[in-house]
Protein backbone atom coordinates (compact mmCIF):
# COMPACT_ATOMS: atom_id res chain seq x y z
CA UNK A 1 0.00 0.00 0.00
CA UNK A 2 1.52 3.32 -0.97
CA UNK A 3 2.26 5.71 1.85
CA UNK A 4 1.22 9.30 2.15
CA UNK A 5 4.76 10.56 1.79
CA UNK A 6 5.83 13.75 3.49
CA UNK A 7 3.06 16.20 4.35
CA UNK A 8 3.86 19.48 2.67
CA UNK A 9 2.17 22.42 4.30
CA UNK A 10 -1.42 21.36 4.91
CA UNK A 11 -2.62 20.71 1.40
CA UNK A 12 -2.61 17.79 -0.96
CA UNK A 13 -1.75 18.56 -4.54
CA UNK A 14 -3.54 16.48 -7.10
CA UNK A 15 -1.86 16.88 -10.46
CA UNK A 16 -4.77 16.35 -12.82
CA UNK A 17 -4.37 16.06 -16.55
CA UNK A 18 -6.78 16.22 -19.43
CA UNK A 19 -7.22 12.94 -21.21
CA UNK A 20 -7.35 13.78 -24.89
CA UNK A 21 -6.42 10.51 -26.53
CA UNK A 22 -6.44 6.92 -25.36
CA UNK A 23 -4.67 4.17 -27.36
CA UNK A 24 -7.34 2.05 -28.99
CA UNK A 25 -10.01 4.58 -28.10
CA UNK A 26 -9.40 7.44 -30.50
CA UNK A 27 -12.86 8.89 -30.06
CA UNK A 28 -12.69 9.34 -26.31
CA UNK A 29 -13.70 12.96 -25.65
CA UNK A 30 -11.37 15.20 -23.71
CA UNK A 31 -11.84 14.90 -19.99
CA UNK A 32 -10.16 14.73 -16.64
CA UNK A 33 -9.11 11.78 -14.52
CA UNK A 34 -8.84 12.61 -10.83
CA UNK A 35 -8.17 10.87 -7.55
CA UNK A 36 -11.11 11.19 -5.16
CA UNK A 37 -11.36 10.68 -1.43
CA UNK A 38 -14.78 11.88 -0.31
CA UNK A 39 -14.28 11.59 3.44
CA UNK A 40 -11.68 12.56 6.01
CA UNK A 41 -9.84 9.24 5.99
CA UNK A 42 -7.78 7.42 3.39
CA UNK A 43 -8.93 4.14 1.81
CA UNK A 44 -12.51 4.03 3.01
CA UNK A 45 -14.49 3.02 -0.12
CA UNK A 46 -15.69 -0.41 -1.16
CA UNK A 47 -16.01 -0.96 -4.92
CA UNK A 48 -19.73 -0.16 -4.87
CA UNK A 49 -19.19 2.92 -2.70
CA UNK A 50 -16.42 4.05 -5.05
CA UNK A 51 -18.75 3.95 -8.05
CA UNK A 52 -21.39 5.88 -6.12
CA UNK A 53 -18.86 8.44 -4.88
CA UNK A 54 -17.86 9.33 -8.44
CA UNK A 55 -21.51 9.61 -9.51
CA UNK A 56 -22.32 11.83 -6.53
CA UNK A 57 -19.55 14.21 -7.46
CA UNK A 58 -20.73 14.55 -11.05
CA UNK A 59 -18.32 12.05 -12.60
CA UNK A 60 -18.01 8.34 -13.37
CA UNK A 61 -15.48 5.82 -12.16
CA UNK A 62 -12.46 5.89 -14.49
CA UNK A 63 -11.44 3.01 -16.74
CA UNK A 64 -7.93 1.53 -16.76
CA UNK A 65 -7.45 3.02 -20.22
CA UNK A 66 -8.35 6.49 -19.00
CA UNK A 67 -5.95 6.21 -16.06
CA UNK A 68 -3.22 4.93 -18.39
CA UNK A 69 -3.76 7.87 -20.75
CA UNK A 70 -3.61 10.26 -17.81
CA UNK A 71 -0.37 8.65 -16.64
CA UNK A 72 1.12 9.00 -20.11
CA UNK A 73 0.23 12.69 -19.98
CA UNK A 74 2.10 13.07 -16.69
CA UNK A 75 -0.47 12.21 -14.00
CA UNK A 76 0.97 10.89 -10.74
CA UNK A 77 -0.79 9.97 -7.50
CA UNK A 78 0.59 7.80 -4.70
CA UNK A 79 -2.85 6.60 -3.61
CA UNK A 80 -4.43 3.29 -4.61
CA UNK A 81 -7.89 3.68 -6.12
CA UNK A 82 -10.66 1.59 -7.62
CA UNK A 83 -11.20 1.57 -11.39
CA UNK A 84 -14.22 0.53 -13.44
CA UNK A 85 -13.01 -3.07 -13.95
CA UNK A 86 -12.71 -3.60 -10.16
CA UNK A 87 -8.94 -3.38 -10.28
CA UNK A 88 -7.03 -1.13 -7.90
CA UNK A 89 -4.25 0.98 -9.39
CA UNK A 90 -2.26 4.19 -9.05
CA UNK A 91 -0.01 6.07 -11.50
CA UNK A 92 3.62 6.84 -10.62
CA UNK A 93 5.82 8.95 -12.88
CA UNK A 94 8.70 9.40 -10.39
CA UNK A 95 9.10 6.20 -8.36
CA UNK A 96 9.89 6.61 -4.65
CA UNK A 97 10.01 4.26 -1.70
CA UNK A 98 6.38 4.28 -0.47
CA UNK A 99 4.99 4.18 -4.01
CA UNK A 100 6.91 1.40 -5.79
CA UNK A 101 4.05 -1.11 -5.76
CA UNK A 102 4.50 -3.90 -8.30
CA UNK A 103 6.91 -2.00 -10.55
CA UNK A 104 10.00 -1.65 -8.32
CA UNK A 105 11.77 1.52 -9.42
CA UNK A 106 10.18 1.78 -12.87
CA UNK A 107 7.59 4.43 -13.71
CA UNK A 108 4.13 3.22 -14.64
CA UNK A 109 0.62 2.52 -13.44
CA UNK A 110 0.87 0.25 -10.41
CA UNK A 111 -1.82 -2.40 -10.05
CA UNK A 112 -3.05 -4.62 -7.23
CA UNK A 113 -5.12 -6.54 -9.79
CA UNK A 114 -8.80 -7.33 -9.33
CA UNK A 115 -9.65 -6.97 -5.66
CA UNK A 116 -12.58 -8.26 -3.59
CA UNK A 117 -15.33 -5.67 -3.74
CA UNK A 118 -15.45 -5.37 0.06
CA UNK A 119 -11.86 -4.15 0.35
CA UNK A 120 -11.53 -0.41 0.77
CA UNK A 121 -9.45 2.07 -1.24
CA UNK A 122 -9.83 5.53 -2.74
CA UNK A 123 -11.21 5.90 -6.28
CA UNK A 124 -10.22 7.39 -9.62
CA UNK A 125 -13.03 9.27 -11.33
CA UNK A 126 -13.45 10.68 -14.82
CA UNK A 127 -15.37 13.80 -15.84
CA UNK A 128 -15.59 14.97 -19.41
CA UNK A 129 -18.01 17.86 -19.60
CA UNK A 130 -19.39 20.73 -17.59
CA UNK A 131 -22.91 21.70 -18.57
CA UNK A 132 -22.92 25.06 -16.87
CA UNK A 133 -20.55 27.34 -15.01
CA UNK A 134 -18.59 27.20 -11.80
CA UNK A 135 -18.15 30.49 -9.98
CA UNK A 136 -16.14 31.54 -6.97
CA UNK A 137 -18.17 33.15 -4.20
CA UNK A 138 -16.98 35.15 -1.24
CA UNK A 139 -17.94 37.88 1.17
CA UNK A 140 -16.24 39.65 4.04
CA UNK A 141 -17.25 37.10 6.68
CA UNK A 142 -17.00 34.20 4.22
CA UNK A 143 -19.26 31.17 4.79
CA UNK A 144 -19.85 28.24 7.06
CA UNK A 145 -20.71 25.14 5.03
CA UNK A 146 -24.44 25.72 5.54
CA UNK A 147 -24.13 29.39 4.63
CA UNK A 148 -22.27 28.41 1.46
CA UNK A 149 -25.10 26.07 0.48
CA UNK A 150 -27.63 28.82 1.08
CA UNK A 151 -25.59 31.47 -0.72
CA UNK A 152 -25.27 29.36 -3.86
CA UNK A 153 -28.98 28.52 -3.79
CA UNK A 154 -29.85 32.20 -3.40
CA UNK A 155 -27.94 32.85 -6.61
CA UNK A 156 -29.78 30.22 -8.62
CA UNK A 157 -26.96 27.72 -8.18
CA UNK A 158 -25.79 24.82 -6.04
CA UNK A 159 -22.56 24.24 -4.21
CA UNK A 160 -20.22 22.78 -6.82
CA UNK A 161 -19.22 19.14 -6.66
CA UNK A 162 -15.60 18.05 -6.75
CA UNK A 163 -16.13 16.71 -10.26
CA UNK A 164 -17.53 20.02 -11.44
CA UNK A 165 -14.54 21.85 -10.00
CA UNK A 166 -12.14 19.51 -11.80
CA UNK A 167 -14.05 20.02 -15.05
CA UNK A 168 -13.95 23.79 -14.57
CA UNK A 169 -10.23 23.62 -13.78
CA UNK A 170 -9.62 21.71 -17.02
CA UNK A 171 -11.31 24.57 -18.85
CA UNK A 172 -9.21 27.26 -17.23
CA UNK A 173 -10.61 28.06 -13.78
CA UNK A 174 -7.72 29.30 -11.62
CA UNK A 175 -8.27 30.52 -8.06
CA UNK A 176 -5.72 30.67 -5.28
CA UNK A 177 -8.39 30.61 -2.58
CA UNK A 178 -9.84 27.40 -1.19
CA UNK A 179 -13.61 27.10 -1.21
CA UNK A 180 -16.32 24.81 0.10
CA UNK A 181 -17.61 22.06 -2.19
CA UNK A 182 -20.78 19.98 -1.92
CA UNK A 183 -19.08 17.07 -0.15
CA UNK A 184 -17.83 19.32 2.64
CA UNK A 185 -14.29 19.36 1.30
CA UNK A 186 -12.16 22.45 0.76
CA UNK A 187 -10.33 22.69 -2.57
CA UNK A 188 -8.96 25.19 -5.07
CA UNK A 189 -8.04 24.99 -8.77
CA UNK A 190 -4.64 26.13 -10.01
CA UNK A 191 -3.90 26.42 -13.73
CA UNK A 192 -0.83 28.65 -13.43
CA UNK A 193 1.33 27.44 -10.53
CA UNK A 194 2.89 30.08 -8.27
CA UNK A 195 4.74 29.77 -4.97
CA UNK A 196 1.92 31.07 -2.79
CA UNK A 197 -0.60 28.66 -4.26
CA UNK A 198 0.59 25.27 -3.12
CA UNK A 199 3.10 23.75 -5.46
CA UNK A 200 4.83 23.88 -8.80
CA UNK A 201 2.33 21.91 -10.88
CA UNK A 202 -1.16 22.69 -12.17
CA UNK A 203 -3.97 20.85 -10.44
CA UNK A 204 -6.78 20.96 -7.95
CA UNK A 205 -5.48 21.24 -4.41
CA UNK A 206 -7.28 19.66 -1.46
CA UNK A 207 -6.97 21.28 1.95
CA UNK A 208 -6.95 18.99 4.96
CA UNK A 209 -7.49 19.90 8.59
CA UNK A 210 -4.40 18.16 9.93
CA UNK A 211 -0.73 18.13 8.86
CA UNK A 212 -0.87 14.39 8.07
CA UNK A 213 -3.35 15.15 5.29
CA UNK A 214 -6.45 13.84 7.00
CA UNK A 215 -9.57 15.49 8.30
CA UNK A 216 -12.23 17.60 6.65
CA UNK A 217 -12.68 21.21 7.78
CA UNK A 218 -15.32 21.70 10.43
CA UNK A 219 -18.64 22.75 8.83
CA UNK A 220 -18.73 25.79 11.13
CA UNK A 221 -15.33 27.09 10.02
CA UNK A 222 -15.45 29.94 7.50
CA UNK A 223 -14.19 29.81 3.94
CA UNK A 224 -14.97 30.91 0.40
CA UNK A 225 -17.16 28.74 -1.83
CA UNK A 226 -17.45 27.42 -5.36
CA UNK A 227 -20.96 27.39 -6.81
CA UNK A 228 -22.29 25.69 -9.94
CA UNK A 229 -25.09 26.96 -12.13
CA UNK A 230 -26.49 24.68 -14.84
CA UNK A 231 -26.80 25.93 -18.38
CA UNK A 232 -30.57 26.23 -18.15
CA UNK A 233 -30.52 28.40 -15.04
CA UNK A 234 -31.64 32.00 -15.42
CA UNK A 235 -29.05 34.62 -14.44
CA UNK A 236 -29.76 36.47 -11.20
CA UNK A 237 -30.91 40.08 -11.38
CA UNK A 238 -27.97 42.37 -11.98
CA UNK A 239 -25.88 39.53 -13.37
CA UNK A 240 -24.70 39.14 -16.92
CA UNK A 241 -23.85 35.63 -18.04
CA UNK A 242 -20.10 35.15 -17.97
CA UNK A 243 -19.39 38.55 -16.55
CA UNK A 244 -18.89 39.96 -13.10
CA UNK A 245 -22.30 40.56 -11.55
CA UNK A 246 -23.40 43.56 -9.63
CA UNK A 247 -22.96 42.80 -5.96
CA UNK A 248 -26.38 42.05 -4.46
CA UNK A 249 -25.37 43.76 -1.23
CA UNK A 250 -22.56 45.93 0.03
CA UNK A 251 -20.93 42.99 1.79
CA UNK A 252 -20.95 40.30 -0.85
CA UNK A 253 -18.24 40.21 -3.44
CA UNK A 254 -18.55 37.36 -5.82
CA UNK A 255 -16.94 36.50 -9.08
CA UNK A 256 -18.47 34.50 -11.91
CA UNK A 257 -16.09 32.61 -14.16
CA UNK A 258 -17.53 31.24 -17.38
CA UNK A 259 -16.04 27.85 -18.22
Amino acid sequence: TPGLGPATAFTSEDLVVQVTAVPGQPHLPGGVVFHYRPGPTRYSLTFEEAQQACLRTGAVIASPEQLQAAYEAGYEQCDAGWLRDQTVRYPIVSPRTPCVGDKDSSPGVRTYGVRPSTETYDVYCFVDRLEGEVFFATRLEQFTFQEALEFCESHNATLATTGQLYAAWSRGLDKCYAGWLADGSLRYPIVTPRPACGGDKPGVRTVYLYPNQTGLPDPLSRHHAFCFRGISAVPSPGEEEGGTPTSPSGVEEWIVTQV
Epitope: A9, F10, T11, L140, E141, Q142, C176, Y177, A178, Y188, A196, C197, G198, R205, V207, Y208, L209, Y210, P217, S221, R222, H223
Partner: nanobody, 115 residues
Framework: EVQLVESGGGLVQPGGSLRLSCAAS????????MYWYRQAPGKQRELVAS???????NYADSVKGRFTISRDNAKNTVYLQMNSLKPEDTAVYYC?????????WGQGTQVTVSS
Protein backbone atom coordinates in the same frame (compact mmCIF):
# COMPACT_ATOMS: atom_id res chain seq x y z
CA GLU B 1 6.04 31.85 9.88
CA VAL B 2 2.63 31.40 11.49
CA GLN B 3 2.82 30.80 15.22
CA LEU B 4 0.00 30.21 17.68
CA VAL B 5 0.84 29.83 21.37
CA GLU B 6 -1.83 28.83 23.89
CA SER B 7 -1.68 29.33 27.64
CA GLY B 8 -3.96 29.36 30.68
CA GLY B 9 -4.81 25.70 31.04
CA GLY B 10 -4.69 23.86 34.34
CA LEU B 11 -6.56 21.83 36.92
CA VAL B 12 -9.87 23.26 38.12
CA GLN B 13 -12.78 21.95 40.16
CA PRO B 14 -16.23 21.42 38.63
CA GLY B 15 -18.10 24.71 38.53
CA GLY B 16 -14.86 26.66 38.35
CA SER B 17 -13.51 28.99 35.64
CA LEU B 18 -10.44 29.30 33.43
CA ARG B 19 -9.36 31.79 30.81
CA LEU B 20 -7.32 30.49 27.90
CA SER B 21 -5.20 32.78 25.74
CA CYS B 22 -3.80 32.31 22.25
CA ALA B 23 -1.08 34.67 21.07
CA ALA B 24 -0.75 34.82 17.29
CA SER B 25 1.90 36.13 14.93
CA UNK B 26 1.09 39.80 14.44
CA UNK B 27 1.08 39.74 10.68
CA UNK B 28 -1.70 37.17 10.52
CA UNK B 29 -3.94 38.11 13.40
CA UNK B 30 -5.98 41.18 12.62
CA UNK B 31 -7.57 39.85 9.45
CA UNK B 32 -8.08 36.22 10.38
CA UNK B 33 -10.92 34.13 11.68
CA MET B 34 -9.81 32.43 14.87
CA TYR B 35 -10.99 29.15 16.39
CA TRP B 36 -10.73 27.14 19.58
CA TYR B 37 -10.87 23.35 19.27
CA ARG B 38 -10.56 20.69 21.93
CA GLN B 39 -9.64 17.04 21.96
CA ALA B 40 -10.57 14.73 24.81
CA PRO B 41 -8.67 11.44 25.24
CA GLY B 42 -9.77 8.92 22.62
CA LYS B 43 -12.08 11.38 20.88
CA GLN B 44 -12.02 13.43 17.69
CA ARG B 45 -10.93 17.04 17.83
CA GLU B 46 -14.02 19.26 17.90
CA LEU B 47 -14.65 22.92 17.21
CA VAL B 48 -15.62 24.70 20.42
CA ALA B 49 -15.86 28.37 19.45
CA SER B 50 -15.05 30.73 16.61
CA UNK B 51 -14.79 34.46 16.14
CA UNK B 52 -14.96 36.34 12.84
CA UNK B 53 -13.24 39.49 11.68
CA UNK B 54 -16.08 41.63 12.94
CA UNK B 55 -16.29 39.86 16.28
CA UNK B 56 -19.27 37.62 15.51
CA UNK B 57 -19.07 34.40 17.50
CA ASN B 58 -20.27 30.81 17.24
CA TYR B 59 -20.23 28.05 19.82
CA ALA B 60 -20.67 24.31 19.99
CA ASP B 61 -23.99 23.42 21.62
CA SER B 62 -22.18 21.74 24.50
CA VAL B 63 -20.55 25.01 25.65
CA LYS B 64 -23.18 27.62 24.77
CA GLY B 65 -23.88 29.94 27.69
CA ARG B 66 -20.75 28.83 29.54
CA PHE B 67 -17.85 29.71 27.21
CA THR B 68 -17.09 33.08 25.63
CA ILE B 69 -14.58 33.71 22.84
CA SER B 70 -13.15 37.19 22.35
CA ARG B 71 -10.23 38.86 20.63
CA ASP B 72 -7.91 41.76 21.28
CA ASN B 73 -6.51 42.88 17.95
CA ALA B 74 -4.08 45.27 19.62
CA LYS B 75 -2.51 42.36 21.48
CA ASN B 76 -2.84 39.81 18.67
CA THR B 77 -4.57 37.52 21.13
CA VAL B 78 -7.76 35.49 21.19
CA TYR B 79 -9.29 34.35 24.48
CA LEU B 80 -11.62 31.61 25.65
CA GLN B 81 -13.34 32.37 28.94
CA MET B 82 -14.66 29.10 30.35
CA ASN B 83 -17.19 29.23 33.20
CA SER B 84 -19.22 26.56 35.00
CA LEU B 85 -16.70 23.94 33.94
CA LYS B 86 -17.74 20.29 33.91
CA PRO B 87 -15.66 17.09 34.02
CA GLU B 88 -16.60 16.49 30.36
CA ASP B 89 -14.78 19.72 29.43
CA THR B 90 -11.50 17.97 30.23
CA ALA B 91 -9.40 18.04 27.08
CA VAL B 92 -6.42 19.59 25.34
CA TYR B 93 -7.55 22.95 23.94
CA TYR B 94 -6.06 24.15 20.66
CA CYS B 95 -6.01 27.51 18.96
CA UNK B 96 -6.49 27.36 15.19
CA UNK B 97 -6.51 29.67 12.19
CA UNK B 98 -6.59 29.37 8.40
CA UNK B 99 -4.12 31.27 6.27
CA UNK B 100 -3.03 30.95 2.63
CA UNK B 101 -5.05 27.77 2.15
CA UNK B 102 -3.60 26.02 5.19
CA UNK B 103 -4.83 25.29 8.70
CA UNK B 104 -2.42 26.15 11.50
CA TRP B 105 -2.50 24.84 15.06
CA GLY B 106 -0.97 25.80 18.36
CA GLN B 107 0.65 23.19 20.57
CA GLY B 108 -2.39 22.97 22.85
CA THR B 109 -3.00 23.59 26.54
CA GLN B 110 -4.37 20.95 28.91
CA VAL B 111 -7.58 21.65 30.84
CA THR B 112 -8.54 19.16 33.53
CA VAL B 113 -11.83 19.49 35.43
CA SER B 114 -11.83 17.25 38.47
CA SER B 115 -12.62 17.34 42.14
Amino acid sequence: EVQLVESGGGLVQPGGSLRLSCAASGSIFSNRFMYWYRQAPGKQRELVASITLSGSTNYADSVKGRFTISRDNAKNTVYLQMNSLKPEDTAVYYCNTFLQNSFYWGQGTQVTVSS
